[in-house]
Interface confidence: medium
């Protein structure tokens, strides 16, 4: 709305940088062939690039990434009882970000 | 995968708490009747609850919220020239979070 301007602070752009995000660990990251298990923890923190750039034709993208293996519990349900095993999930952390030109593909003539 | 366990650190649960997220300011928050304008800044930071809880039947939810009005630029294009106006967008910040029981509705019999 255009009303109640007095109390409003000027909006500050969310700059393009890494922020902490929550990554849900889906079961198919661990085992695509079997659905009879649970994963713990169900979510972890990752570093991801987010925010906006000063120009419409650029996007905030990761300029440096790092793969980070973490150990999770794979809780298999065998005959209605759990068996705890370990599994490794590889997370992607963004270490640095940049505002990168978005190349829109030209239509083929 | 169950391989390469040695190098992997144990995964740590992303606890239920407020984190900084990026909120995209969509044009229809400002004017639903007109698409002939731009908004600046296009995105801002907000505080939002995220993460996981220790129990299956609970979800991370905001237990305290605050509405925060911010002033943005509405850049209207009038006869191919920009006209700058002010507009207020009300953002929702989460101040506190809690793991709240999810009540799954029972089927009506």
């Amino acid at each position: 709305s255009l009303g109640s301007l007095a109390a409003a602070e000027p909006a500050v752009i969310a700059e393009c940088k890494t922020r902490t995000e929550v990554f849900q660990i889906s079961r198919n990251l661990i085992d695509r062939t079997n659905a009879n298990f649970l994963v713990w923890p169900p979510c972890v923190e990752v570093q991801r690039c987010s925010g906006c750039c000063n120009n419409r034709n650029v996007q905030c993208r990761a300029s440096q990434v790092q793969m980070r293996p973490v150990q999770v519990r794979k809780i298999e349900i065998v005959r209605k009882k759990p068996v705890f095993k370990k599994a490794t999930v590889t997370l992607e952390d963004h270490l640095a970000c940049k505002c990168e030109t978005v190349v829109t593909p030209r239509p083929v003539t | 995968s169950l391989g390469s366990l040695a190098a992997a650190e144990p995964a740590v649960i992303a606890e239920c708490k407020t984190r900084t997220e990026v909120f995209q300011i969509s044009r229809n928050l400002i004017d639903r009747t007109n698409a002939n304008f731009l908004v600046w800044p296009p995105c801002v930071e907000v505080q939002r609850c995220s993460g996981c809880c220790n129990n299956r039947n609970v979800q991370c939810r905001a237990s305290q919220v605050q509405m925060r009005p911010v002033q943005v630029r509405k850049i209207e294009i009038v006869r191919k020239k920009p006209v700058f106006k002010k507009a207020t967008v009300t953002l929702e910040d989460h101040l506190a979070c809690k793991c709240e029981t999810v009540v799954t509705p029972r089927p009506v019999t």
């Epitope: 759990p82 068996v83 705890f84 370990k86 | -």
Partner: antibody, heavy 120, light 107 residues
Framework: EVQLVESGGGLVQPGGSLRLSCAAS????????MSWVRQAPGKGLEWVSY????????YYADSVKGRFTISRDNSKNTLYLQMNSLRAEDTAVYYC?????????????WGQGTLVTVSS | SYELTQPPSVSVAPGQTARISCSGD??????VHWYQQKPGQAPVLVIY???NRPSGIPERFSGSNSGNTATLTISGTQAEDEADYYC?????????FGGGTKLTVLQ
């Protein structure tokens, strides 16, 4: 204060029954899985039984299967172990212990234990 | 049934490093926890999930687990560390404890 307090131990004859209780306080009992662990005099720890947060999952060591029953009353913040057909080899200190998650995991909080003696 | 094997006793001089082993078939595939028990007291968790220390446990306690063996390491052992130590793993539908190791701190 976060604690577990066991009660109900004592002297019982072989073939007899006993019901142990474990009162939890200082934490949200209904969010945690629980176990009973026992220790015979001068011996090591032996896991006895487990129950999930909501009581839907229960399992037992082979040595007590069919004789012991684990249960919980989340409204009373209490864990139970019903022990029937007791034998001399069941003589031990019985500890209740808390798992940090609904599915189990390590035992991060233990009670002080209650002694069960099976003897004629 | 699954078994975890520990040495019955380990001796160490004060200030030295004590290592207590725990072995089991493919133990590295499971999460191992370690408990300390002093005479007349309930056990206390000192290491969980192979190598994590609960709050309040001194930094001198550490753990590792790979292959068929998990190890509890106590660096700069102190007299107060004298106790029984038990490894534990949740494997096939049951929590299994090792037989326990009596750690003696030589005077």
């Amino acid at each position: 204060e976060v604690q577990l307090v066991e009660s109900g131990g004592g002297l019982v004859q072989p073939g007899g029954s006993l019901r142990l209780s474990c009162a939890a306080s200082g934490f949200t009992f209904s969010s945690y899985a629980m176990s009973w662990v026992r220790q015979a005099p001068g011996k090591g720890l032996e896991w006895v039984s487990y129950i999930s947060d909501d009581g839907s999952l229960k399992y037992y060591a082979d040595s007590v299967k069919g004789r012991f029953t684990i249960s919980r009353d989340n409204s009373k913040n209490t864990l139970y172990l019903q022990m029937n057909s007791l034998r001399a080899e069941d003589t031990a200190v019985y500890y209740c212990a808390r798992h940090p998650y609904w599915y189990g995991g390590q035992l991060d909080l233990w009670g002080q234990g209650t002694l069960v003696t099976v003897s004629s | 049934s699954y078994e975890l094997t520990q040495p019955p006793s380990v001796s160490v001089a004060p200030g030295q490093t004590a290592r207590i082993s725990c072995s089991g078939d493919s133990l590295g595939s499971y999460f191992v926890h370690w408990y300390q028990q002093k005479p007349g007291q309930a056990p206390v968790l000192v290491i969980y999930d192979d190598s994590n220390r609960p709050s309040g446990i001194p930094e001198r306690f550490s753990g590792s687990n790979s292959g068929n063996t998990a190890t509890l390491t106590i660096s700069g052992t102190q007299a107060e560390d004298e106790a029984d130590y038990y490894c534990s793993a949740f494997t096939h539908n049951s929590d299994v404890f090792g037989g326990g190791t009596k750690l003696t701190v030589l005077q």
